[in-house]
C-alpha cells in the first residue's frame, strides 16, 4: 500500500514551493503537476448561486483566506 | 461529461478473489482521480481508494492490502481486485471521479458483490 | 483518521420546512484557505449525488436551495425549503487527510 506525500506533511509545514508556469499545485498529493494532468470543474450555468468558478489562480494571486472561490488546481501557488 | 460503467459484480464465496471494471467515458483516465468507494446493505458510505493520473494508488487502511487497484489507459477502465474476501465485504461498488479538492462529481451506478458460501 | 460526525442520524419534516444537518469533524479539514467538505444527497438504489463541494459551493445543476456553510470541523448543510424530491439520505465527506472518510449519513424523512 503506497501513501500519497499528503500523509507525511505535517498540517503546520510551510506552504508548498510554487509550481513553474504551466504546472499546477495538485492539492491531493500537495505537489506541482501538469495542469492538464487535473481535472476542473464543470462551468456553472448561468444565474446559479455562487460565482462561477475560475481554471486557475493567477500568479500574483496568494492562496489565503480570500482565495475560496479559486478554481483549483493552482499554477504558481505562492 | 463523464460516464461510469462498472461490471464483474456477483456472488463469490469467502476467501475468493473478484475483480471489478470501470469503464469511463468523457475524459481520460490519465487526468484527474478515480476512486471506489462501497456501501454495505443498509449501511453508509465507506471510501476503498484511488489511482490517480500518474498511476499512483492509495487505499483507506482498514482494508488491509486486501483490495488492489489497476488501470488500463488503452481502455480508458480502472479496475478494483479484490482478493480473501469476507462476508462483511458485502456491498455495493462504485467508481467515481473527482474535482482537484477531493469532492465526487461523477459516479457509476454501482454494482453489488455478495460474499456468501 | 478523521471522523465526521453527523447529526441528526434522522429527521421527520414537511415539503416547504428548512432543514439543517450539521457535521462535526475530529480535527480540521481546511488547508490552504479550503475546506476540504463536501455534500452528497443518496436515494435508495442510486449512486450518491454531489450537491456542495469545498463546504458552501454549489455543484452545477443543484438547485439553489442547498446550501452550504462552515469551516475547521463544524459544518452545515441547509435545505431552505424542502422539496418531494428532497427525502433522501445526505452524507458529507472530508478529503482533507488520507483516508477520505463520511459521516454516518442522514436520512430526511416525511413527517
Known amino acids: 500500500m503506497r501513501r500519497g506525500p499528503r500523509s507525511l506533511r505535517g498540517r503546520d509545514a510551510p506552504a508548498p514551493t510554487p509550481c513553474v508556469p504551466a504546472e499546477c499545485f495538485d492539492l491531493l498529493v500537495r505537489h506541482c503537476v501538469a495542469c492538464g494532468l487535473l481535472r476542473t470543474p464543470r462551468p456553472k450555468p448561468a444565474g446559479a448561486s455562487s460565482p462561477a468558478p475560475r481554471t486557475a489562480l493567477q500568479p500574483q494571486e496568494s492562496v489565503g483566506a480570500g482565495a475560496g472561490e479559486a478554481a483549483l488546481p493552482l499554477p504558481g501557488l505562492l | 461529461e463523464v460516464q461510469l460503467v462498472e461490471s464483474g459484480g456477483g456472488l463469490v464465496q469467502p476467501g475468493g478473489s473478484l475483480r471489478l471494471s470501470c469503464a469511463a467515458s468523457?475524459?481520460?483516465?490519465?487526468?484527474?482521480?478515480w476512486n471506489w468507494v462501497r456501501q454495505a446493505p443498509g449501511k453508509g458510505l465507506e471510501w476503498v481508494g484511488y489511482?490517480?493520473?500518474?498511476?499512483?494508488?492509495y487505499y483507506n487502511p482498514s482494508l488491509k492490502s486486501r483490495f488492489t487497484i489497476s488501470r488500463d489507459t488503452s481502455k480508458n477502465t480502472f479496475y478494483l481486485q479484490m482478493n480473501s474476501l469476507r462476508a462483511e465485504d458485502t456491498a455495493v461498488y462504485y467508481c467515481a471521479t473527482t474535482l482537484p479538492y477531493g469532492a465526487m462529481d461523477y459516479w457509476g451506478q454501482g454494482t453489488l458483490v455478495t460474499v456468501s458460501s | 483518521d478523521i471522523q465526521m460526525t453527523q447529526s441528526p442520524s434522522s429527521l421527520s419534516a414537511s415539503v416547504g420546512d428548512r432543514v439543517t444537518i450539521t457535521c462535526r469533524a475530529s480535527?480540521?479539514?481546511?488547508?490552504?484557505?479550503?475546506?476540504?467538505m463536501h455534500w452528497y444527497q443518496q436515494k435508495p438504489g442510486k449512486a450518491p449525488k454531489l450537491l456542495i463541494y469545498?463546504?458552501?459551493d454549489l455543484e452545477s445543476g443543484v438547485p439553489s436551495r442547498f446550501s452550504g456553510s462552515g469551516s475547521g470541523t463544524d459544518f452545515t448543510l441547509t435545505i431552505s425549503s424542502l422539496q418531494p424530491e428532497d427525502f433522501a439520505t445526505y452524507y458529507c465527506?472530508?478529503?482533507?487527510?488520507?483516508?477520505?472518510?463520511f459521516g454516518q449519513g442522514t436520512k430526511v424523512e416525511i413527517k
Open positions: 469545498r463546504a458552501s
Open positions: 489511482i490517480n493520473y500518474s498511476g499512483t494508488t
Open positions: 480535527e480540521s479539514v481546511d488547508d490552504y484557505g479550503i475546506s476540504f
Open positions: 465527506q472530508q478529503t482533507s487527510k488520507d483516508p477520505w472518510t
Open positions: 468523457g475524459d481520460s483516465i490519465t487526468r484527474g482521480y
